[in-house]
């Protein structure tokens, strides 16, 4: 028999939401417009291009990649479309609000739509730690505060730090990671007798996980250079992401093969790792000045990634009840500071060379940017695992963790869908 | 000869509205972000705003803002002010400059204006 | 970041040291430059990231400073040096010009 969304949620998901949606529509009603300027379409094209592979990454990268377990890839796929469309109309009202909001409308370009999709990312990072544990209303309340919070502290890092657009976003590993990470910490953690299978992966989900991660392979590119302010920046971002996720893809396989006591490749591990240069060279990625380092940082976060597989899902799943197939989290807090790390290493070498104590400086406030970024993720994710923890929520039964038939209908019932 | 040439200044009434262009000649617009900056009569330089090189952001000073836009079409070389409900305080020469930038450090990179036009005068009197 | 420059104007001799002053309200790390403007002519970059000469400009421009105070040194003053001298910073928006620093013949 089928299992239903429990009465009070059927009543409490569709009302929050669409009353949600319908104050959205109003905020945008009274307080956007778009940007009146006659511009070049071909400018406008090729403008738009960056903001679909985004979107592209958002919805089919990240929406496949966290669709590997066996009896919850719908909700996977759904959920995460479901987050992006939400995240990125309340991100461009909050980047508005933030940004430009003392001087009247928000003016809404491509641009900002561009910075909310990157926002709205961060959550589907963020919930790969909690996905088949909660229900819609519960990542509704998530979107919320993770928007809000990235938006905040990039508008904190921008004013304190005077940090541009790209060196403020690529936080966005570290702040996804940690607050992903701290949500968890806070739901239910044991999975009961009779469902471990349900966070086990299988074999068609897999494939369409590692279709995601084809997807955010070919378009990280295009994350890592989207707001970057000139062309030869951009070039260089696009240039040294290419070689490091390329390398790491290389290393991912061959390490995970090495990995094994027979040699055999791990599927979760592929998924993640391909993906590990990409991170790792987010934060300088138009600093570097040569492929050959970036493809040993793609090297160095390959060999990071396979090994974080190996070791920490066992760890990760005892403190924080995250399934060994959700990686995303971990894996990106440490590729992240990694990154990170990268970029503080550049400073100091110039520091050195310089012999100037105002890039000195520099790094003391880039290690208080980190600081800051990783303090506010782990703050307002406990936040937001404190509040998905009301009852008033109806979060699913940890009986029911990992189930699509919770909440989708299916015309045959038959188990092993 | 690397060039930016300025037109559609003259006299406006407060109010009104004008629109300057800005043609770039010898190197691709696109490749560059631009900036407009104007003078007013016996004062100093002060930036108006900023456009990125392929038009996805804009920057403008707080005088301006709401009343100024900017705009670049890349397929005809050409960078745009438009100048909305003008005041007695926007007459000015207003310049066109290109940003230029380079990585001098291993960390950053730097911005400045490293070509600017001949100017084009805006006067706004009743 | 607001600039002020000292000292607002000054006179000097041809084959003259003159150096032009630029503080920043706060601190700019090496996003300065400076720009010669002529009467009746646009300005002209002379100095990048503070200490960097643009390709073309006589090497007797120099810059120097970070942080807060920035130095422009004209080592020996050229009768086309005469002019107007502005620095800007780069480093964050709206990038601030300073009010400008006349040299002209004593």
């Known amino acids: 028999m089928s299992s239903k969304y429990p009465r009070s949620v059927r009543r409490c998901l569709p009302l929050w939401a669409l009353t949600l949606e319908a104050a959205l529509i109003l905020l945008f009603y009274f307080f956007t417009h778009y940007d009146a300027s006659l511009e070049d379409q071909k400018g406008l094209v090729a403008s738009y291009q960056v903001g679909q592979d985004l979107t592209v990454m958002a919805a089919i990268g990240l929406g496949f990649l966290t669709s590997s377990f066996r009896r919850h890839s719908w909700s996977s796929v759904a959920f995460n479309l479901f987050m992006l469309a939400l995240g990125v109309q309340w991100a461009i009202l909050l980047d508005g609000f933030l940004s430009q909001f003392p001087s009247g409308k928000v003016v809404i370009t491509l641009f900002s739509i561009r910075l909310a999709t990157m926002s709205a990312l961060s959550v589907l990072i963020s919930v790969d730690a909690v996905l088949g544990k909660v229900n819609l209303a519960q990542l509704v309340v998530m979107v919320l505060v993770e928007v809000t919070a990235l938006g905040n502290l990039r508008m904190v890092i921008s004013n304190i730090f005077n940090t541009d657009y790209h060196m403020n976003m690529m936080h966005i590993y570290v702040f996804a990671a940690y607050f992903g990470l701290s949500v968890a910490w806070c739901l239910p953690k044991p999975l009961p007798e009779g469902t471990e299978d349900k966070d086990q992966t299988a074999t068609i989900p897999s494939l369409s996980a590692m279709l995601g991660a084809l997807f955010l392979w070919m378009f990280w590119p295009s994350f890592n250079s989207a707001l970057l302010r000139s062309p030869i920046e951009r070039k260089n971002a696009v240039f040294n992401t290419y070689y490091a996720v390329a390398v790491s893809v290389v290393t991912a396989i061959s390490g995970s093969s090495l990995a094994h006591p027979q040699g055999k490749i791990s599927k979760t591990y592929v998924h993640s790792a391909v993906l590990a240069g990409g991170v790792a060279v987010g934060t300088s990625c138009h600093l570097i000045p040569s492929p050959w380092l970036a493809m040993v940082l793609g090297l160095v976060a390959g060999l990071i990634s396979v090994g974080g597989a190996k070791y920490l899902p066992g760890c990760c799943n005892r403190v924080l009840g995250i399934p060994h197939s959700s990686i995303m989290g971990y894996n990106f807090s440490l590729l992240g500071l990694l990154g990170e790390i990268i970029y503080i290493v550049l400073l100091v070498l110039d520091t050195v060379g310089a012999g100037n104590g105002m890039i000195g400086f520099q790094v003391l406030l880039s290690i208080g940017e980190l600081s800051l970024a990783i303090v506010i993720a782990l703050m307002s994710g406990l936040l937001t695992g404190l509040l998905l923890n009301l009852k008033i929520w109806k979060a699913p039964h940890e009986a029911k963790y990992f189930d699509d038939q919770v909440f989708w209908k299916f015309p045959h019932l038959a188990v092993g869908f | 000869e690397v060039q930016l040439l300025e037109s559609g200044g003259g006299v406006v009434q407060p109010g009104r509205s004008l629109r300057l262009s800005c043609e770039a000649s010898k190197f691709t617009l696109y490749n560059y972000g631009m900036h407009w900056v104007r003078q007013a009569p016996g004062k100093g330089l002060e930036w108006v705003a900023f456009?990125?090189?392929?038009?996805?952001?804009?920057y403008y000073e707080d005088s301006v803002k709401g009343r100024f836009t900017v705009s670049r079409d890349n397929s005809k070389n050409t960078l745009y002010l438009q100048m909305n409900s003008l005041r007695a305080e926007d007459t000015a020469v207003y310049y066109c400059a290109r940003e230029g930038s380079k990585k001098v450090a291993l960390s950053r990179y730097y911005y400045y204006m490293d070509v600017w036009g001949q100017g084009t005068t805006v006067t706004v009197s009743s | 970041a607001e600039l002020t420059q000292s000292p607002s104007s000054l006179s000097a001799s041809v084959g003259d040291r003159v150096t032009i002053t630029c503080r920043a309200s706060q601190s700019i790390s090496s996003y300065l430059n400076w720009y010669q403007q002529k009467p009746g002519k646009s300005p002209k970059l002379l100095i990048y990231a503070a200490s960097s000469l643009q390709s073309g400009v006589p090497s007797r421009f120099s810059g120097s400073g970070s942080g807060t105070d920035f130095t422009l040194t004209i080592s020996s003053l050229q009768p086309e040096d005469f002019a107007t001298y502005y620095c800007?910073?780069?480093?964050?928006?709206?990038?601030?010009f300073g009010p400008g620093t006349k040299v002209d013949i004593k």
């Open positions: 456009i990125w090189f392929d038009g996805s952001n804009k």
């Open positions: 800007q910073q780069s480093y964050s928006t709206p990038p601030a």
